[in-house]
Interface confidence: low
């Protein structure tokens, strides 16, 4: 028989590659290679003869997840070896294309390019709060769905998110990717009380969510390097800015923080008055 | 307002028809898996439906599989429970529920009578 | 029978603290995924109290806490008042390949004495 069988399935193609070191035996005439599932499993039994220079050959169309056995005969004439036998279980394969789209304070996109096989039955979309875990979230899609949107989830928190291609009795490996929600702006930028050289800036809170401080900025649009910065209490939805520059315009943003993460800012621009002569 | 409204209960003789409906407000129904479980009198919560979010896959308790069947009609926001071949055992209200972290928005309720 | 078993009744004086258990199996709770829990005043619809094992919705009180450990899950209500009369559910997700299956318990009906 021949000797050194090694089997190799890639799971992206299909293809199922065996290889073996040529029999010494004189005068062969070529290989005869089996490959059938095994314990009486679903699926095609397949087969392949090679000339006996041959040391190689591929099959198609195995069903990934699903357990072959794959025998090489030294055929000469009309006799045949004992086999050289082992055994493979094509992966199932996994998405290489998982990206993010449309990422706001509760929801998250996924996009990929489902998978081209006729075994796929869907995938499954798997939501864990990053460090915890515990799927707080599972849903199915179908084997031609290439989009989800996973909702109902809390901002500014971190999510490593899984999709798992699914086939009859079995599943790959998890294609994971970590994304933030974003944390929600503050709104309703307004500018009263104006001075020579004060302003009350309010804001209106984004609601649904415990900050745990808004950030104030503010220089002279002429003068943008020189920004002032304070940390609001996110009980507190207005502040006073003092000490500015008579007949002036100001940029001024006001951001949301949730622990360490902050949202976009808010942003508007107001001249503070003129000194009375 | 995040919202759903049932309707189309009533009822029915053993091996009639129904179609009940959930109309959503305050959120986009497509982006979320949407659930229908239902209340026999007097009894618990049992879950009997789903269509996923985002892909429009199905599933059923295995009490239903076969005679119920779960849609929906994104441009009206609108979620659909056409049940077949009623039993007595199918009489409960049942309710609409949308799927994030947990069933955080259910319907009020539309109540089945088979009888 | 439900999957997951609650006790069917539990009560308490005002003020006390009562504890509804929730018992699943390796095919559910055990299995990793959360608990939630459900509040169902007569009459009404259910209404998400616990998400996540122990998160609370906004608006719901602090005395409502949740909590899990291997295939079982409790929620507590410390300073039970005569609102929280009502009925309670726990639930989780099923292992059902391709199923979307949700599991409830036979619910908890909470009395105030």
């Known amino acids: 028989p021949p000797t050194n069988l090694h089997l190799e399935a890639n799971p992206d193609t299909g293809v199922l590659t065996v290889s073996w070191e040529r029999s010494t035996t004189p005068d062969i005439t070529g290989y005869r290679i089996t490959t059938t599932p095994t314990n009486g499993q679903q699926g095609n039994s397949l087969e392949e003869v090679v000339h006996a220079d041959q040391s190689s050959c591929t099959f198609d169309n195995l069903s990934p997840g699903l357990e072959y056995n794959v025998s090489v005969y030294t055929v000469k004439d009309d006799k045949e070896s004992v086999p050289i036998s082992d055994t493979i279980i094509p992966e199932v394969p996994q998405l290489t294309d998982l990206s993010f789209v449309d990422i706001t304070d509760s929801s998250i996109g996924l996009r990929w390019t489902p998978l081209n096989s006729s075994t796929i039955i869907g995938y499954r979309i798997t939501v864990v709060a990053a460090g915890e875990g515990i799927p707080i979230f599972e849903d199915f899609v179908d084997s031609s769905v290439g989009y989800y949107t996973v909702t109902g989830l809390e901002p500014g928190i971190d999510y490593d998110i899984s999709v798992i291609t699914l086939i009859n009795g079995g599943e790959s490996a998890p294609t994971t990717l970590t994304q933030q929600t974003a944390v929600p702006p503050p709104t309703d930028l307004r500018f009263t009380n104006i001075g020579p050289d004060t302003m009350r800036v309010t804001w209106a809170p984004p609601p649904s969510i415990d900050l745990t401080n808004f950030l104030v900025r503010y220089s002279p649009v002429k003068n943008e390097e020189d920004v002032a910065e304070l940390s609001i209490s996110p009980s507190d939805n207005a502040v006073v800015l003092t000490n500015l520059l008579p007949g002036t315009e100001y940029v001024v943003s006001v951001s949301s923080v949730y622990e360490q993460h902050e949202s976009t800012p808010l942003r508007g621009r107001q001249k503070t008055g003129l000194d009375s002569p | 307002e995040v919202q759903l409204v049932e309707s189309g209960g009533g009822l029915v003789q053993p091996g009639g028809s129904l179609r009940l409906s959930c109309a959503a407000s305050?959120?986009?129904?497509?982006?979320?898996?949407m659930h229908w479980v239902r209340q026999a009198p007097g009894k618990g919560l049992e879950w009997v439906s789903t269509?996923?979010?985002?892909?429009?896959?199905?599933y059923y308790a295995d009490s239903v599989k076969g005679r119920f069947t779960i849609s929906r009609d994104n441009s009206k926001n609108t979620l659909y429970l056409q049940m077949n071949s009623l039993r007595a055992e199918d009489t409960a209200v049942y309710y609409c529920a949308r799927r994030g972290r947990a069933f955080d928005i259910w319907g009020q309720g539309t109540t089945v009578t088979v009888s | 029978q439900s999957v997951l078993t609650q006790p069917p009744s539990v009560s308490g004086a005002p003020g006390q603290r009562v504890t509804i258990s929730c018992t699943g199996s390796s095919s559910n709770i055990g299995a990793g995924y959360d608990v939630h829990w459900y509040q169902q005043l007569p009459g009404t619809a259910p209404k998400l109290l616990i998400y996540?094992?122990?998160n609370r919705p906004s608006g719901v009180p602090d005395r409502f806490s949740g909590s899990k450990s291997g295939t079982s899950a409790s929620l507590a209500i410390t300073g039970l008042q005569a609102e929280d009369e009502a009925d309670y559910y726990c639930s989780s997700p099923m292992i059902s390949s391709l199923s979307g299956h949700v599991v409830f318990g036979g619910g908890t009906k909470v009395t105030v004495l």
């Open positions: 996540g094992n122990s």
């Open positions: 305050g959120f986009t129904l497509s982006s979320y898996a």
């Open positions: 269509i996923s979010g985002g892909g429009g896959s199905t």
